[in-house]
Amino acid sequence: EDELQVIQPEKSVSVAAGESATLRCAMTSLIPVGPIMWFRGAGAGRELIYNQKEGHFPRVTTVSELTKRNNLDFSISISNITPADAGTYYCVKFRKGSPDDVEFKSGAGTELSVRAKPS
C-alpha cells in the first residue's frame, strides 16, 4: 500500500501542432530518493525528454517547482509541438545509486497525438 506509485493520469493527450502539451505525472511517495526522468518510447531505443537531475531541455518546462520541499508533481509541458513529437511518454522514477542511478518504477505511459494546426 505504501510503496511508491508513479501516476500518469491520462492514457492519451491530443494537442494541435504549435501548441504546448502538458504531460502529467506524480509520485505517491518521496521514497526512495532519486531523480525522475521523462522518456518517449520504451526499451533500449527510448528517447530522453527530460532529466530532473541534469541536462538542458529548452522545450520542456516543469509544471510545478521541482525544488520545492515535498513536491510530488513531476508534470512537464513541452512547447511548440510538431507531428514528430507524437508517441508514448513515460515518467520514470530512478533510485539513487553509485555510480549510476537505477530505474525503480515507470508510469503506464501517456500517448501524445498531434492534430493538424487549425487553419
Epitope: E1, D2, Q5, I7, P9, K11, T28, L72, D73, A108
Partner: antibody, heavy 119, light 107 residues
Framework: QVQLVQSGAEVKKPGSSVKVSCKAS????????ISWVRQAPGQGLEWMGG????????NYAQKFQGRVTITADESTSTAYMELSSLRSEDTAVYYC????????????WGKGTTVTVSS | DIQMTQSPSSLSASVGDRVTITCRAS??????LNWYQQKPGKAPKLLIY???SLQSGVPSRFSGSGSGTDFTLTISSLQPEDFATYYC?????????FGGGTKVEIK
Amino acid sequence: QVQLVQSGAEVKKPGSSVKVSCKASGGTFSSYAISWVRQAPGQGLEWMGGIAPIFGTANYAQKFQGRVTITADESTSTAYMELSSLRSEDTAVYYCARTTYRDYYMDVWGKGTTVTVSS
Amino acid sequence: DIQMTQSPSSLSASVGDRVTITCRASQSISSYLNWYQQKPGKAPKLLIYAASSLQSGVPSRFSGSGSGTDFTLTISSLQPEDFATYYCQQAYPYPLTFGGGTKVEIK
C-alpha cells in the same frame, strides 16, 4: 476495505452555501481522484466536478463553473464540495466517488448527502 | 462537452430475458466508457469499465462492448436483482458526463 464517509443531511435557504465533506478510509487517498455527482429527485446522475489531490487540481462541469469549489485535504484524506448561491433546483442527493485515473471510472461511492434548499 | 444518449429510456423485461442497452457519444471517445447500476435510494454501483472490462465481483451475465461512439451493455439472462436503472458514463476527461439512464422494469 475502502470506504467514503459523507457528512450529514443539510437544509439550506436559497442564496446560501453548503459544504459537503467526504472522508476516505482504508486506501491510498493520493492514488485516486474524487468526483462529485448529484442526483435530483427522480432524475439521473450529473457529474459536477472532481479533484486530483496529488496534483492539487480540480475540474468542473461548465454548468457549475463559478458556483462550485472542490478541495481536498490530504492530511485527513478528506474531499470537500462547496456549492454557493443555492436555489431550489439544487435540492438533490450529492455523492462523492473514488475515481480511478486513466479510465476515470467511479468504483467506490459514498452513501450520499441529501441537501434540501427551501425558504 | 461530450453528450451521451442512452436508449431506451425504459424497458420492461422478464426474468431470464436477454437485455441490451445502448449508449451513443456525440463524438468518438475510444473505449472510455463505463456502466453503472443504481437501485432506488442507493448509490450507483460500477459494473463495466473501459467499455468491456467487468468490475470485480460483478456477475458474468453483465457484459459491455463497443468503441468510438456506440456502446452496448448486455445482461445475458435477467435476474430478479437486476431490475434497476443503468447509466453509461464517458470518461474521456474532462468533463465527465453521464447518459440519461435506462430503467429496467419487470414485465
